[in-house]
Every structure is written in structure tokens, then in C-alpha cells.
């Protein structure tokens, strides 16, 4: 059967019917419904929301909707013993304490179960000592402190500003520097855009607002107690001492009012340069310790949070494919929030809900997709991508054989300026073609395509007339599908103007002020950007599930492989003498990339010419496309990161949010000049070039004629 036989509607009309059914007013209504109370992972409220979504997806017309539960390690503050930080005098008296909770937003004063700001998975402890200001706590910040300024963080409590990199990397860096505690704070330089009022009068962060978040270094492991396997009823759990990725020192987040009180007394070294200064009226001295008059005062942390094995619930909906039911296209986004989740995640969950409703409407009219579509509402994303990872671990054998694509659906907006897409190169042409067919919601682009406004506002740095598409990193639920299983993945959302807004993320991220009103009043009153994101995400899912030939272009992978090979070669060539001494050659990698390019080109020619009415040949060609992403997976994983198995892309070792290309080679080269054993270090570079070259060549061969 062709997909047209399965549908009774022409393919063009299918897509139009699906897109026309998506309504901004519905997304608005769903967002309101999902944001009236907190939905923290592991709580009764989030279980009830899971059951509501299950019920509604069934009403919308999905074939089946099931809850998948797991018992995973979560972390909560102690309700009777709050976390806080003090300045103590020489007698040990607390002369200043940080806040115990955020001032609630208007209209939410009587809402119960708002979790106070905390760093999830922080160990308990009450360390006291001198403070050292470490800027963003990036790898380069600690290099500056330790190597250039000769400042020792050992035994100190460090204070770092949020932004630039994932908070878990900051904590890892502080631990490695010997710190005994970490204070994270939001500096107005990063979380207060000039000319905008703070919430509730605008979308900026008030001084009492605080960013929550986990501080794990899981490297794709999922539940810290069951790495590699689902946290099911018969799971064997590690002891807490063997758990994956837990921090070893207490950590706590604060807002900028509290940070002002800690930083204004700082003495010691002056900041090394202006890039270490934020926007508070403080000197940004590095320390260690307080200045003259206050030198006998210390900082003390009081952290009493507990780690608890808790049940979480994913909602998994199925719309069975008419022709290839054993091929899965997955649309997934999380449901759990830190508090109200006005943007993260419910702006995404509301879009997923409307996409499900639209697909359900078509199904009720007799239509089915060619391939099966799976819809997922993930739990415990905020605690380390746990729900998605456990489900993927439980279903890994099915997914690696049947998974066509995964489209992520967390926050639909982080701004209202232009589109932002991160995806596998296989999806570049799909995204380009789709956005050319969609209308731009942007002011000044009436009657123009989304492709046009996106390209104008966010041009590709390499190719003129094309929009920027970024590499996938991590920090969201696509991680297990892409980085571990090698399933082609993508994500799309509306974003800010990165050139004019230099703050990190959006100001109210993970704070109590991320409410429905934030979105409705300040970001997207007409919900037109939400609708556009629904059209992009839904349109991608539709095409991936319904096109006769999978909408993947392997030639785009060839282009980026060459670019990434050039880039990593340039990095290595910063050490020409050592490359000569240790006979380091990239010839094998460039040769493999050349072979890949030629084979991909020939495959694409065959793809144009083959007989699409022959179901066996069609399935064969589609399988070659589907399995291409899988071919970049190394079963042994990256060094010390067994669950990051993609050889072309991995989350940066220095920032989980960012993607790194040829990560094995990149990490082997990183800071190589400081390695104690250069011979061993350059040997590892050579090994990583070998692994990369082999993998690219092996992937190329999957596109060759089968016999």
C-alpha cells in the first residue's frame, strides 16, 4: 500500500489540513490549564496532570495512551529545615541570611507547594569559610584564577554567576578546584535586559528571583542509581556512594539582592578584566575573603536537602501508521516544572497538546500517517532528563531498530524575535523546505515566509541566503535518542535577538515568576509565535511520518563533516611541532570524509531514480536513510562518557548545553600543552582520529549499493 491508499486524501491536502487545524487560541487555553499550580516531578500534582493528559489524548483520538512509570532518584529541600547562606561574625553569629523563598507573584500568594529555590542533588552540609568569586565558573575562569592569578580555591566557598554554561559544569569545575561549597547567583548583567521592567511589570528578573536547577554531571546516564537500565520494579540500584554524577559539595542558588550583600564586602584581588564584572554596584573583587573591616567575617552554608527514590510518570501516546507501523517518529517534551512552568515546559507541552489534537482530528476523519507517531509527555526532565532516558533504556531495542526521528518539544519560546533550530544535518533540507511553506509571524514580514524572516534575522555564518541551524548539544530530552541511540533528532523554538540581548537564556528561567501571565502579557499575547512553533514541530513530524521517501538528505552530512574535519585539524595545527614529533596525521579522516561525500552523492542520485512503487526497494532506501544516523554510534562510547556514543556530536565536556563536533578528538586536544605525559596525550589524539575516520568510513559504506 502507498501512503495515499492509506489516507484517501492527497498528500498536499493532508499537510494543509493538519496545519490549518492548529489554533493559537487552543494553545493559549492549554497553557493556562497547565500552569495554574506547580507540577514538580515526583509530586501528586504532576501525577494528576499525567492522568489528565492521558485522558485528553485518548479523547483527541490516539490509538492508545499509556503511563510508563519509573522509580528514580530525585531531590527535595527539607520542609522543616530550610536551606540558606549566612554571613557570620567572629563569634559565629549570623549577621545576614539569604532569603528562604521568592516573593510570590501577584495572584499566586496562596498557592501551596511552591518549592523554594534549591540546587537539586546538592549534598547536605554546613561548610563555612572565605568566599572566592569565580565569574561564570567556566573552565577558562578557573584557568585564569589558578594559572594567571595564582588564587587557590581549595577549602574556599566559591560564588559563581549563572550563565554561559550549564550549572552542573560550574559545580564540577569548582569541585575539581578544591572548593568546599558553591553559591550560584543571577547577575543583572545576564538576567536583566536594559530598558525592561522586572516582573510583574515586565519580563526581567527581580532581585528576589532565583533560578532553580539540577547540578548533576550525568553524561547521559539517566537515573543516577540505574545507569544503562530502566529504573523498574526489579531494578538493582547502586548505593548512593556509587551513584552517577552526584555533586560532592553543597550548592545553593540566590538572587541578586542576596548576592549584593555577599559580594559588596569582597576583598583580595581585583577582577582580572572587565569580563569578570557584572552589573551590581560591587567591586567584583575575587577574594579570597572579605575586605579589611569585614575580614573576620565568613560565609556559612546551611543545606539540608535530601535525595529520595520517587515514582515518576511518562505519558506515551500512539498513532499507528497505516503502511509502516514498525517505523516510529517521536514527538516528545517534558511535563514536569520547577514551579508553574509558564515557559519551561508548558509553552512546549501546550503546543504538543494542540499537535496531538490536530492529528487526532485527521484520524477521526479516516486518515492515518504512513508511519507510527509516538507522542510523549516526559517526567523529571528537570532532574536530569530522567523520564525520557528511562523510557528509552526500557525500549532501546525497539528504538534502535525502528526509530526514524525524534522531535523535541520543550519551551516553545525563549524570546519572540526569530526561529531557532538545532538538528541533525539530515533534517536541514526538511526544515528549509517546511519553513518556506509557512507564513512568518514577525512584524514587518507580513505575507513573507518564515524562511525569509528567519534567514534575514538569523543568517547562516557559512552560506548566504540560508538561516543558521545549530548543532544539537544536550540539556534536554532529545539527548538519549540522539547522543546514545543515534536517532535523527531536531528541536525548534522562537528565540531572542542574541546580538542585542546578551543575557543567558531568558531572565525568569526556572523562577517562581515563570507564569502564564509572563507569556500572555509580555512574550506572545496573540500566541502567534506559539502557533508558528507548533507548525514547525508538527510539520516536521507530519513529513517524517508521512512522506513516501524519508525527508533526509545525506549530502548535508557530507558538507558538515568536511567543515568539522577542517575545524578540528585547525585546532590540532596550533601544535605543529608536536604533530610532527608524534606523527599525527588527519589524512585518514579527510579521506573518509571524501569517501562519504562521494558515496552520499551517488546515493542521492539513486534516490531520485529508483522505482518508488516497489515497496521492497522503497523500504531498503528508507532504511539506509534511517540507519545513517545510527551508523555514527560507537558502541564503546566516548572516553569516560559511555552513554555519549555519537562520534560526530556530543555535549561539550565544558558546557552540557553546547554541542561539540568530533568530540573525541576535541577533548583529546583540549589543554594538551599542560599534559604531564605529552607522548601519551598525543597518542590519544591519534587514537581518536582513528576512531573518527573509521566511523565516518563505516557510515559512508552504509549508503553504498547493498550488493
Amino acid at each position: 500500500k502507498s501512503s495515499n491508499e492509506a489516507t484517501n486524501i492527497t498528500p498536499k491536502h493532508n499537510m494543509k489540513a493538519f496545519l490549518d487545524e492548529l489554533k493559537a487560541e487552543n494553545i493559549k487555553k492549554f497553557l493556562y490549564n497547565f500552569t495554574q499550580i506547580p507540577h514538580l516531578a515526583g509530586t501528586e500534582q504532576n501525577f494528576q496532570l499525567a492522568k489528565q493528559i492521558q485522558s485528553q489524548w485518548k479523547e483527541f483520538g490516539l490509538d492508545s495512551v499509556e503511563l510508563a512509570h519509573y522509580d528514580v532518584l530525585l531531590s527535595y529541600p527539607n520542609k522543616t529545615h530550610p536551606n540558606y547562606i549566612s554571613i557570620i561574625n567572629e563569634d559565629g553569629n549570623e549577621i545576614f541570611n539569604t532569603s528562604l523563598f521568592e516573593p510570590p507573584p501577584p495572584g499566586y500568594e496562596n498557592v501551596s507547594d511552591i518549592v523554594p529555590p534549591f540546587s537539586a542533588f546538592s549534598p547536605q552540609g554546613m561548610p563555612e569559610g572565605d568566599l572566592v568569586y569565580v565569574n561564570y565558573a567556566r573552565t577558562e575562569d578557573f584557568f585564569k584564577l589558578e594559572r594567571d592569578m595564582k588564587i587557590n580555591c581549595s577549602g574556599k566557598i566559591v560564588i559563581a554567576r549563572y550563565g554561559k554554561v550549564f550549572r552542573g559544569n560550574k559545580v564540577k569545575n569548582a569541585q575539581l578546584a578544591g572548593a568546599k561549597g558553591v553559591i550560584l547567583y543571577s547577575d543583572p548583567a545576564d538576567y536583566f535586559a536594559p530598558g525592561v521592567k522586572s516582573y510583574p511589570d515586565g519580563w526581567n528578573l527581580p532581585g528576589g528571583g532565583v533560578q532553580r536547577g539540577n547540578i548533576l554531571n550525568l553524561n547521559g546516564a539517566g537515573d543516577p542509581l540505574t545507569p544503562g537500565y530502566p529504573a523498574n520494579e526489579y531494578a538493582y540500584r547502586r548505593g548512593i556512594a556509587e551513584a552517577v554524577g552526584l555533586p560532592s559539595i553543597p550548592v545553593h542558588p540566590i538572587g541578586y539582592y542576596d548576592a549584593q550583600k555577599l559580594l559588596e564586602k569582597m576583598g583580595g584581588s581585583a577582577p582580572p578584566d572587565s569580563s569578570w564584572r557584572g552589573s551590581l554596584k560591587v567591586p567584583y573583587n575575587v577574594g579570597p575573603g572579605f575586605t579589611g573591616n569585614f575580614s573576620t567575617q565568613k560565609v556559612k552554608m546551611h543545606i539540608h536537602s535530601t535525595n529520595e527514590v520517587t515514582r515518576i510518570y511518562n505519558v506515551i501516546g500512539t498513532l499507528r501508521g497505516a503502511v509502516e507501523p514498525d517505523r516510529y517518529v517521536i514527538l516528545g517534551g517534558h511535563r514536569d516544572s520547577w514551579v508553574f512552568g509558564g515557559i519551561d515546559p508548558q509553552s512546549g507541552a501546550a503546543v504538543v497538546h494542540e499537535i496531538v489534537r490536530s492529528f487526532g482530528t485527521l484520524k477521526k476523519e479516516g486518515w492515518r500517517p504512513r508511519r507510527t507517531i509516538l507522542f510523549a509527555s516526559w517526567d523529571a526532565e528537570e532532574f536530569g532528563l530522567l523520564g525520557s532516558t528511562e523510557w528509552a533504556e526500557e525500549n532501546s531495542r525497539l528504538l534502535q531498530e525502528r526509530g526514524v526521528a525524534y522531535i523535541n518539544a520543550d519551551s516553545s519560546i525563549e524570546g519572540n524575535y526569530t526561529l531557532r533550530v538545532d538538528c541533525t544535518p539530515l533534517m536541514y533540507s526538511l526544515v528549509h523546505n517546511l519553513t518556506k511553506e509557512l507564513k512568518s509571524p514577525d512584524e514587518g514580514f507580513e505575507g513573507k515566509s518564515l524562511y525569509e524572516s528567519w534567514t534575514k534575522k538569523s543568517p547562516s555564518p557559512e552560506f548566504s541566503g540560508m538561516p543558521r541551524i545549530s548543532k544539537l548539544g544536550s540539556g534536554n530530552d532529545f539527548e538519549v535518542f540522539f547522543q546514545r541511540l543515534g536517532i535523527a533528532s531536531g528541536r525548534a523554538r522562537y528565540t531572542k535577538n542574541w546580538e542585542t540581548n546578551k543575557f543567558s537564556g531568558y531572565p525568569l528561567y526556572h523562577s517562581v515568576y515563570e507564569t502564564y501571565e509572563l507569556v500572555e502579557k509580555f512574550y506572545d499575547p496573540m500566541f502567534k509565535y506559539h502557533l508558528t512553533v507548533a507548525q514547525v514541530r508538527g510539520g516536521m513530524v507530519f513529513e517524517l511520518a508521512n512522506s513516501i521517501v524519508l525527508p533526509f538528505d545525506c549530502r548535508d552530512y557530507a558538507v558538515v563533516l568536511r567543515k568539522y574535519a577542517d575545524k578540528i585539524y585547525s585546532i590540532s595545527m596550533k601544535h605543529p611541532q608536536e604533530m610532527k614529533t608524534y606523527s599525527v596525521s588527519f589524512d585518514s579522516l579527510f579521506s573518509a570524509v571524501k569517501n562519504f561525500t562521494e558515496i552520499a552523492s551517488k546515493f542521492s542520485e539513486r534516490l531520485q531514480d529508483f522505482d518508488k512503487s516497489n515497496p521492497i526497494v522503497l523500504r531498503m532506501m528508507n532504511d539506509q536513510l534511517m540507519f545513517l544516523e545510527r551508523a555514527f554510534i560507537d558502541p564503546l562510547g566516548l572516553p569516560d562518557r559511555p552513554f555519549y556514543r555519537h562520534v560526530i556530536y556530543a555535549p561539550s565536556s565544558h558546557n552540557k548545553y553546547a554541542g561539540e563536533s568530533f568530540p573525541g578528538i576535541y577533548d583529546a586536544l583540549f589543554d594538551i600543552e599542560s599534559k604531564v605525559d605529552p607522548s601519551k596525550a598525543w597518542g590519544e589524539v591519534k587514537r581518536q582520529i582513528y576512531v573518527a575516520a573509521f566511523t565516518v568510513q563505516a557510515a559512508a559504506e552504509t549508503l553504498s549499493e547493498v550488493a
Partner: nanobody, 123 residues
Amino acid sequence: EVQLVESGGGVVQPGRSLRLSCAASGFPLISYGMHWVRQAPGKGLEWVAFMTYDGSNRYYADSVKGRFTISRDNSKNTLYLQMNSLRDEDTALYYCARDRIVGGRVPDAFDIWGQGTMVTVSS
């Protein structure tokens, strides 16, 4: 309408105790730091005490430190001042006032005042 209403004042002997209350209406007490301020007959205003919105910090004037305790019950939208070991010089009209900065961590300026409650310490 936003308002603060003080109560609990009266005549008391030196060395005795008194508890003042301040009922807030028209705004959520939970988001604001709150002050007690007093004005002795024929004198200027004197700041007495401040408590942050969340109760994490309390600040007192040296003249009342160790004798007065500021507290709050956010669920009742009420601020209190427990005054022990009262002295003649504590005689004053006591006002509660709202700090102008939502979520402020230290005493700042006041933006809303009550009408005051009179405390007279006399033997």
C-alpha cells in the same frame, strides 16, 4: 484599598510587656519587608525594627535590641512587635510601615504607613 492598621497600644508600667499588631489589607504581606517606626511626643521619627518578607533577617535599633522582637504571620497578613522590659523612653506613637522594595533584603524606604497606636510607659 491598601492599608495598614495598628492595634495593641495602651498604658503600661515600666518593666512590663506589650504586643502590638499591624493588620495589612489590599496587598500581600508575604512579598514585603515590614518596619516598625515610632515618634515620641515632641520628637522626630525613630526607626525601631525591620523584618524581611520571608522572616530570614531582622534588624533592630540599638535602643530596643534585646528587648523588642519583630515577627509576622504571613497567612494572617499581620505584623507584630513584642515589647518587653518597657522603659519610659519607649513612650511613643508606634507605626508599622511597608518597605518599598518587593523582596528587599535590608531596610530601605517606606511607602505605606498606618495611622499608629499609642504606647505610654508610666508608673
